[in-house]
């Protein structure tokens, strides 16, 4: 190799200057004794190289690019060789930003997958390979004192969420959780969350059903629907409150909310609806009075209210 480039830093803040030097060895005897070293950034020739002959006979050219405004580019030094440019060496330059502080970190405990799922917003594009790590530790108190560390959770590339398996958690005990972002230009950390996984539990919704009419029970009144729901079995022993929402299937009506209903109600007569009208209904629940997250809305149940009973007019006949 006749030439070698060294740079002040291969990765810099976008817009920062960068200095490079290209040295041509003396034993490249086939070269012009006083060759002129040229610089190229990408496809563009760069003026401003300062060239000198060193005491050992090597040639050196130094260039300072005042602002590196490309997020990625190749810098090369070259010589004119006949009618063409002979590349001696090239380096990849990267420019970008240090990671911003990840924000809006939030977590939920999924009892179905037995994992604590945390998500965050990574902040603006850094233009550099940036790794995110969800870090956590167990704590007996309010996370001021750090207990055992929990295995780092590394999301798949490009994802801004990560799942900590339940085997690494302690339910009913606080844990400190934060996100660390790192690239070649720096490291940043989100504010720390302190939470008990059970306080961010997200339950599955109950299954809505129509109540089977029993022979002895009175049929629903006009404009009423008789509903029942089957609780999500794995969450059966968690105290919850629930809410229903309903809307007519036809038309542009928005959802009407009914609640709170105790999960234990298990059956409910919903009245005040339009008679002979098809309705869509859904239910969702939340751990209560202890903290938790609302479940998703249940799959829809579609029911029709009964007709209005015919009114009896008494006709008086005159003889």
């Amino acid at each position: 190799e006749c030439g070698h480039i060294s740079v002040s830093a291969p990765i810099v803040h976008l817009g920062d200057p960068i200095t490079a030097s290209c040295i041509i060895k003396q034993n490249c005897s086939h070269l012009d004794p006083e060759p002129q070293i040229l610089w190229r950034l990408g496809a563009e020739l760069q003026p401003g190289g300062r060239q000198q002959r060193l005491s050992d006979g090597t040639q050196e050219s130094i260039i300072t690019l005042p602002h590196l405004n490309h997020t990625q580019a190749f810098l090369s030094c070259a010589l004119n060789w006949g009618n063409s440019l002979q590349i001696l060496d090239q380096v990849e330059l990267r420019a970008g930003y240090p990671p911003a502080i990840p924000h809006n970190l939030s977590c939920l405990m999924n009892l179905t997958t037995s994992s604590l799922i945390c998500q965050w917003e990574p902040g603006p594009e850094t233009h550099l390979p940036t790794s995110f790590t969800l870090k956590s530790f167990k704590s007996r108190g309010n996370c001021q004192t750090q207990g055992d560390s929990i295995l780092d959770c590394v999301p798949k590339d490009g994802q801004s969420h990560c799942s900590i398996p339940a085997k690494h958690l302690l339910l009913y005990q606080n844990m400190g959780i934060w996100v660390q972002a790192e690239n070649a230009l720096g490291t940043s950390m989100s504010p720390q969350l302190c939470l008990d996984p059970m306080d961010v539990v997200k339950l599955e919704p109950p299954m809505l059903r129509t109540m089977d009419p029993s022979p002895e029970a009175a049929p629903p009144q006009a404009g009423c629907l008789q509903l029942s729901w089957e609780p999500w079995q794995p969450g059966l022993h968690i105290n919850q409150k629930c809410e229903l929402r309903h809307k007519p299937q036809r038309g542009e009506a928005s959802w009407a909310l009914v609640g709170p209903l105790p999960l234990e109600a298990l059956q409910y007569e919903l009245c005040g609806l339009l008679p002979a009208t098809a309705y869509t209904l859904q239910i969702r629940c939340i751990r209560w009075p202890l903290p938790g997250h609302w479940s998703d809305w249940s799959p829809s149940l579609e029911l029709r209210t009964t007709e209005r009973a015919p009114t009896h007019h008494h006709h008086h006949h005159h003889h």
Epitope: L111, S114, K167, M198, Q233, P234, L236, E264, L266
Partner: antibody
Framework: EVQLLESGGGLVQPGGSLRLSCAAS????????MGWVRQAPGKGLEWVSS????????PYADSVKGRFTISRDNSKNTLYLQMNSLRAEDTAVYYC???????????WGQGTLVTVSS | DIQMTQSPSSLSASVGDRVTITCRAS??????LNWYQQKPGKAPKLLIY???NLQNGVPSRFSGSGSGTDFTLTISSLQPEDFATYYC?????????FGGGTKVEIK
């Protein structure tokens, strides 16, 4: 300290009835599911029934369904098990227990022995 | 109903031994598996809940692992007070069901 104290066990003839009670103290009784678990002599543990915090949900084991009724009085911090149409195979130590949110039993009472025999 | 199968039904071990008891569910129960210790004439005592959570006051030589259908209770170094019968219990759905028990005896 959480304490559960069962009472009401004893000797009863087949077809007879018995009512077990469990007095709870040391925790907010009205916020927790409660349950009954039994253990026949020399055998393993068998869940009998549970009751939700306000009494609206009461699942039962198939072996006692229709014969046993679980209930609670939150004003008295007391859990009950009404046992009717008793059979020899209902002979067991009956434990009352507080249920955790994810369905574990803790703590347990000391148990009361029910013997069904003629 | 979910059946719980515990193995072995009994084992003999010495003080200081590492002891492993397994529990298998007839269908997936996520992490809804609890472990109890019972000594003769006494009520059961909760050791582990939700597969791997050590109950307050239980020595750290007890640990639980597993999810889905296969679960393990491990006593890392058996102590004289650990000779007892151990039960697993699923709490994924009613009816709540227990394993048949594992009696740990002195060799």
């Amino acid at each position: 300290e959480v304490q559960l104290l069962e009472s009401g066990g004893g000797l009863v003839q087949p077809g007879g009835s018995l009512r077990l009670s469990c007095a709870a103290s040391g925790f907010t009784f009205s916020l927790y599911w409660m349950g009954w678990v039994r253990q026949a002599p020399g055998k393993g543990l068998e869940w009998v029934s549970s009751i939700s915090s306000s009494g609206g949900v009461t699942p039962y084991a198939d072996s006692v369904k229709g014969r046993f009724t679980i209930s609670r009085d939150n004003s008295k911090n007391t859990l009950y098990l009404q046992m009717n149409s008793l059979r020899a195979e209902d002979t067991a130590v009956y434990y009352c227990a507080k249920l955790g949110e994810l369905g574990w039993f803790d703590p347990w009472g000391q148990g009361t022995l029910v013997t069904v025999s003629s | 109903d979910i059946q719980m199968t515990q193995s072995p039904s009994s084992l003999s071990a010495s003080v200081g031994d590492r002891v492993t008891i397994t529990c298998r569910a007839s269908q997936g129960i996520s992490s809804y598996l609890n472990w109890y210790q019972q000594k003769p004439g006494k009520a059961p005592k909760l050791l582990i809940y939700y597969a791997s959570n050590l109950q307050n006051g239980v020595p750290s030589r007890f640990s639980g692992s597993g999810s889905g259908t296969d679960f393990t209770l491990t006593i890392s170094s058996l102590q004289p007070e650990d000779f007892a019968t151990y039960y697993c219990q699923q709490s994924y759905s009613t009816p709540l069901t227990f394993g048949g028990g594992t009696k740990v005896e002195i060799k």
